[in-house]
């Protein structure tokens, strides 16, 4: 539906508060280095302009597209060239090329200081002094560090952030109330950001068809009682929402997401029996709840898939008539029967089925050719099952920290060219699959584990894309979205890698390690482990384990010593010498 003024339309639909928050998110995700005050000024100017358009949609410039309005505003920033370098060249372009240019300059790993959490009393004072600024600052800091964060979901996080401060700043023990809530929001926020980053990568690197296939599989698992036509409608709408958000069209995205939630709640009966509670909540909670809703029960007595997709004499006819619709139906039918499979496995099966039909429907006897297609699925299903079984066994044996260390060694041997901070970050996240998924029964392990690994490996892919250093990473990241995890799993030691020169400084530790949090101390030790493997990629696990055990004992001993710094200096030298001897460095 055409509106005379797009900006007025979105302002009226979303309301002033959400409009301002979304414009701030959009600007912070584009200009990640700009100071908070500059962004607030730009947002206020845009908001005042939007209000003039609401009053009179025919007013000057009100007919311009949002990209034109926002792009023009961003291009007024005086320090654009000094701060962003070649991104300033985007401003010489016309829409839609200008927006595409801004999108290409989004930085997944911006050079920004780590967010340090102030004392609780300091935060509560800031919250009470100026609640609006305090919450805007939260949106700004998250958005600039996570330039693909799902904007309408960030509004939900901000609402929870506000609620936490409102409640806890009045509590007797403010810290005991607030800190766990902030930790939870931080962890959930990182997970939400990574999940959305995969959706955007899927759309931007592999196209709309790839995203739609993912959505068909996931929604069919979630809503197995819904008809194929209903699932297809939801997939189309969801694809539009995510295409908009990934493209920086945050106002449209939030508006369309609200419409989709409204539609789902109005049509619960034909979608899922699990939506009742979600649909009683306010908008932001409702949308979040729907996105996380548990799978509905499978309809009883679903017929065998073979009848329509293998035994029917019309398979090739149906496929030829509408290939993507037929494959979509196959994916829908397979996914609704298999909530125990990961989405990526379901997509691999659909791809195998498609490849078989492409080959067999051109053969002399198509039916004879594709009759055993389901037999080809067995190894594809067993591969992730075996991998999850093995890794959960190792996780249960080692616990999370040592399991992460095993993965650090594994991935450093596979792709030693990748930067140490990236290897540590990615391997630590890969290792979290254990605590997250291994506790589940068999039927829930694979969707939990493999779909989570897809999200984490996408982090590796987007970080590596910024500074490519490994052909093997590039290959696994770009060849096939659904085969990324099997591609990385299959990698053996990189025989072309020339071991890193030994540098004693890398393995020199100081007393400051003793005052670090447990997490920070782990990261220090894991950084040393990666560096060790980069120096000695042929070291066996037993050798590395012995060195790490000695290292842990060394840190523990020196942190208990009276003269910590002397202990680290003297014992550190001995440890390095012993490790060199043990590993033949």
């Amino acid at each position: 539906d055409a509106h005379k003024s797009e900006v007025a339309h979105r302002f009226k639909d979303l309301g002033e508060e959400n409009f301002k928050a979304l414009v701030l998110i959009a600007f912070a995700q584009y200009l990640q280095q700009c100071p908070f005050e500059d962004h607030v000024k730009l947002v206020n100017e845009v908001t005042e302009f939007a209000k003039t358009c609401v009053a009179d949609e025919s007013a000057e410039n009100c007919d311009k597209s949002l990209h034109t309005l926002f792009g023009d505003k961003l291009c007024t920033v005086a320090t654009l060239r000094e701060t962003y370098g070649e991104m300033a060249d985007c401003c010489a372009k016309q829409e839609p090329e200008r927006n595409e240019c801004f999108l290409q300059h989004k930085d997944d790993n911006p050079n920004l200081p780590r967010l340090v959490r102030p004392e609780v009393d300091v935060m509560c004072t800031a919250f009470h002094d100026n609640e609006e600024t305090f919450l805007k600052k939260y949106l700004y800091e998250i958005a600039r560090r996570h330039p693909y964060f799902y904007a309408p979901e960030l509004l939900f996080f901000a609402k929870r952030y506000k609620a936490a401060f409102t409640e806890c700043c009045q509590a007797a023990d403010k810290a005991a109330c607030l800190l766990p809530k902030l930790d939870e929001l931080r962890d959930e926020g990182k997970a939400s950001s990574a999940k959305q980053r995969l959706k955007c990568a899927s759309l931007q690197k592999f196209g709309e068809r790839a995203f739609k296939a993912w959505a068909v599989a996931r929604l069919s698992q979630r809503f197995p009682k819904a008809e194929f036509a209903e699932v297809s409608k939801l997939v189309t709408d969801l694809t539009k929402v995510h295409t908009e958000c990934c493209h920086g069209d945050l106002l449209e995205c939030a508006d369309d997401r609200a419409d989709l939630a409204k539609y789902i709640c109005e049509n619960q009966d034909s979608i899922s029996s699990k939506l009742k509670e979600c649909c009683e909540k306010p908008l932001l909670e409702k949308s979040h709840c729907i996105a996380e809703v548990e799978n509905d029960e499978m309809p009883a007595d679903l017929p065998s898939l073979a009848a329509d997709f293998v035994e029917s004499k019309d398979v090739c006819k149906n496929y030829a008539e509408a290939k993507d619709v037929f494959l979509g139906m196959f994916l829908y039918e397979y996914a609704r029967r298999h909530p125990d499979y990961s989405v990526v496995l379901l997509l691999r099966l659909a791809k195998t089925y498609e490849t078989t039909l492409e080959k067999c429907c051109a053969a002399a006897d198509p039916h004879e050719c594709y009759a055993k297609v389901f037999d080809e699925f067995k190894p594809l299903v067993e591969e992730p099952q075996n991998l999850i079984k093995q890794n959960c066994e190792l996780f249960e044996q080692l616990g999370e920290y040592k399991f992460q260390n095993a993965l650090l060694v594994r991935y450093t041997k596979k792709v030693p060219q990748v930067s140490t901070p990236t290897l540590v970050e990615v391997s630590r996240n890969l290792g979290k699959v254990g605590s997250k998924c291994c506790k589940h029964p068999e039927a829930k392990r694979m969707p939990c584990a493999e779909d989570y690994l897809s999200v984490v490996l996408n982090q590796l892919c987007v970080l590596h894309e910024k500074t490519p250093v490994s052909d093997r990473v590039t290959k696994c990241c770009t060849e096939s979205l659904v085969n990324r995890r099997p591609c990385f799993s299959a990698l053996e030691v990189d025989e072309t890698y020339v071991p890193k020169e030994f540098n004693a400084e890398t393995f020199t530790f100081h007393a400051d390690i003793c005052t670090l949090s447990e997490k920070e101390r782990q990261i220090k030790k894991q950084t040393a482990l990666v560096e060790l493997v980069k120096h000695k990629p042929k070291a066996t696990k037993e050798q590395l384990k012995a060195v790490m055990d000695d290292f842990a004992a060394f840190v523990e001993k020196c942190c208990k010593a009276d003269d910590k710094e002397t202990c680290f200096a003297e014992e550190g030298k001995k440890l390095v010498a012993a490790s060199q001897a043990a590993l033949g460095l």
Partner: nanobody
């Protein structure tokens, strides 16, 4: 240090059988998983089969499933690979390996110790 010695290789006709053994000495064999890998002429080393430390989980490459059986006797510090319905494409040097995690991984770099290999030739 674990030492591994393979035996049982040889020349066999297509359709025939062979049983490979892997004798271990050194630390306690039952704490290690065992794997069999092979290297066909002019090709990369590839996974064949593995068995975890307790012997209750076994894994096979798709190409040998249903034809090969891996087993172990912890009392004898020995692992076995029973190969039947052999094909010319099974011709390779077969290596036994030990994994200190006790899991029985598919990747060769996960194994700490290796034998020197035994030649298996399938030809008429």
């Amino acid at each position: 240090q674990v030492q591994l010695v393979e035996s049982g290789g040889g020349l066999v006709q297509p359709g025939g059988s062979l049983r490979l053994s892997c004798a271990a000495s050194g630390p306690i064999f039952s704490t290690y998983a065992m794997g069999w890998f092979r290297q066909p002429p002019g090709k990369e080393r590839e996974f064949v089969a593995s068995i975890n430390r307790s012997g209750d989980s076994t894994y096979y490459a798709d190409s040998v499933k249903g034809r090969f059986t891996i087993s172990r006797d912890n009392a004898k510090n020995t692992g076995y690979l029973q190969m039947s319905s052999l094909k010319p494409e099974d011709t390779a040097v077969y290596y036994c390996a030990a994994d200190s995690d006790g899991i029985g991984w598919f990747n060769s770099f996960e194994y700490d110790y290796w034998g020197r290999g035994t030649q298996v030739t399938v030809s008429s």
